[in-house]
Amino acid sequence: SSLTSWAPSAAASTSPPASAASAPPPLPGQCPQPCECSEAARTVKCVNRNLTEVPADLPPYVRNLFLTGNQLAVLPPGAFARRPPLAELAALNLSGSSLREVCAGAFEHLPSLRQLDLSHNPLGNLSAFAFAGSDASRSGPSPLVELMLNHIVPPDDRRQNRSFEGMVAAALRAGRALRGLQCLELAGNRFLYLPRDVLAQLPGLRHLDLRNNSLVSLTYVSFRNLTHLESLHLEDNALKVLHNATLAELQSLPHVRVFLDNNPWVCDCHMADMVAWLKETEVVPGKAGLTCAFPEKMRNRALLELNSSHLDCDPILPPSLQTS
């Protein structure tokens, strides 16, 4: 069977264009040639097949679609738009498929899509309207509940001349499409910072995974509107200290658990507020395992065992005495 995918123009309307009808409608029991299908399980697996395009003839019963380990490179607008539409498709896994670009409206006409995994793809070009639709002003909210974007940072030589953090943030913000999102995974993306308003359009978030990034500070990001947040994963970053404003925000969230293991905490005078908070809070599981990384004399000391006499700062020399 053909592997040619129908790819409408960027000006796709809100229903699949008539040109989609030129491909014969799939037969009820048909399975794309390189795939394995189970109608009983409503599952299609096209795994490790070096596909360069999304199969055109996906069966309309598909609920779970695995397209992992392929060579897709680009997801065009309406990559999954079909006649009849894939109305049942709820879980779509595209991880590890060499995707470099996801175009605006790539996931349009998937009314039941609740779970999307784009992890382990070098996404140098993620359209701001990848999840919002190609015409964000006319498309409604995305049905997505879980979005996995782990390890999508491209190698340095493939990065566009713009902030990767900003590109991802724009896709999460666009058109307020993801306001129903409950689970967002962004682990392993070498994020240096979180854009100030990246979470503003995600009020339904319950689970946010930022593990294994390079976050140094949370100073500019606000968690205040994430009143449903249940777990915030910040393990394996470059966090030095959490400041009072952040601590107060986290404490005010009624359900949250914050995971802070394996960060290089700097145990100097700026750490006093965080230590005091840790001693009182229920928010941080495993808090007894948090240890200082700096200064050298404090290395491997448990944060919970510190008191104010341990947390000093070297006096700053007056400018006239500073040397370069």
Partner: antibody, heavy 125, light 107 residues
Framework: QVQLVQSGGGLVQPGGSLRLSCAAS????????MSWVRQAPGKGLEWVSA????????HDADSVKGRFTISRDNSKNTLYLEMNSLRAEDTAVYYC??????????????????WGQGTTVTVSS | EIVLTQSPATLSLSPGERATLSCRAS??????LAWYQQKPGQAPRLLIY???NRATGIPARFSGSGSGTDFTLTISSLEPEDFAVYYC?????????FGQGTKVEIK
């Protein structure tokens, strides 16, 4: 101290309904997922249902899906299990348990670290 | 669903002896495994979480090890109060599942 106190068990006919309650104290209830686990007479433990700290996410065992509903009222520090269309095979001691995580998506698992005393549900005609 | 198989079903030992209980998963559960102790007429009690971490208040004679599919609970020297049924439980995949239990009885 941290404790869970259960109520609401009893004898019910097949097809009947029952509501179990579990009152929590001594910890911040809304920050913990909660589970129901049951144990049929002379048998092992069987997980029934779980709910996240906010109450926004739930999971049910296939054996009770569509018949049992887990819920919580964080303002009352209380967990519930609404059981409908009861069958003989639902006869068991039902335990509520505090989970050592908050989100049902979570990676860290701290086990079910606090358990209620158990309440007996008998389904028989 | 993931099936946990515990062995042996029954372990007959004397106080002071070492008890080694096994739990095998039908597929990897990483380290998302807990061990519980249950005595007749009582609720289960958490002993070990994340495969090897002792829960609060659990004596040092209890230890857990393993990762992936094979796990072990060791009681280094049995005390009279340790004779009970022990269950392993995974929370790697939904639904969470329990092993069928190992009964440690007095020889």
């Amino acid at each position: 101290q941290v404790q869970l106190v259960q109520s609401g068990g009893g004898l019910v006919q097949p097809g009947g309904s029952l509501r179990l309650s579990c009152a929590a104290s001594g910890f911040t209830f809304s920050r913990n997922a909660m589970s129901w686990v049951r144990q049929a007479p002379g048998k092992g433990l069987e997980w029934v249902s779980a709910i996240s700290g906010s109450g926004g996410s739930t999971h049910d065992a296939d054996s009770v899906k569509g018949r049992f509903t887990i819920s919580r009222d964080n303002s009352k520090n209380t967990l519930y299990l609404e059981m409908n269309s009861l069958r003989a095979e639902d006869t068991a001691v039902y335990y509520c348990a505090k989970d050592g995580y908050s989100s049902l998506w979570d990676y860290h698992y701290y086990g079910m670290d606090v358990w209620g005393q158990g309440t007996t549900v008998t389904v028989s005609s | 669903e993931i099936v946990l198989t515990q062995s042996p079903a029954t372990l007959s030992l004397s106080p002071g002896e070492r008890a080694t209980l096994s739990c095998r998963a039908s597929q990897s559960v990483s380290s998302y495994l807990a061990w519980y102790q249950q005595k007749p007429g009582q609720a289960p009690r958490l002993l070990i979480y994340d495969a090897s971490n002792r829960a609060t208040g659990i004596p040092a004679r209890f230890s857990g090890s393993g990762s992936g599919t094979d796990f072990t609970l060791t009681i280094s020297s049995l005390e009279p109060e340790d004779f009970a049924v022990y269950y392993c439980q995974q929370r790697s995949n939904w639904p969470p599942t329990f092993g069928q239990g190992t009964k440690v009885e007095i020889k």
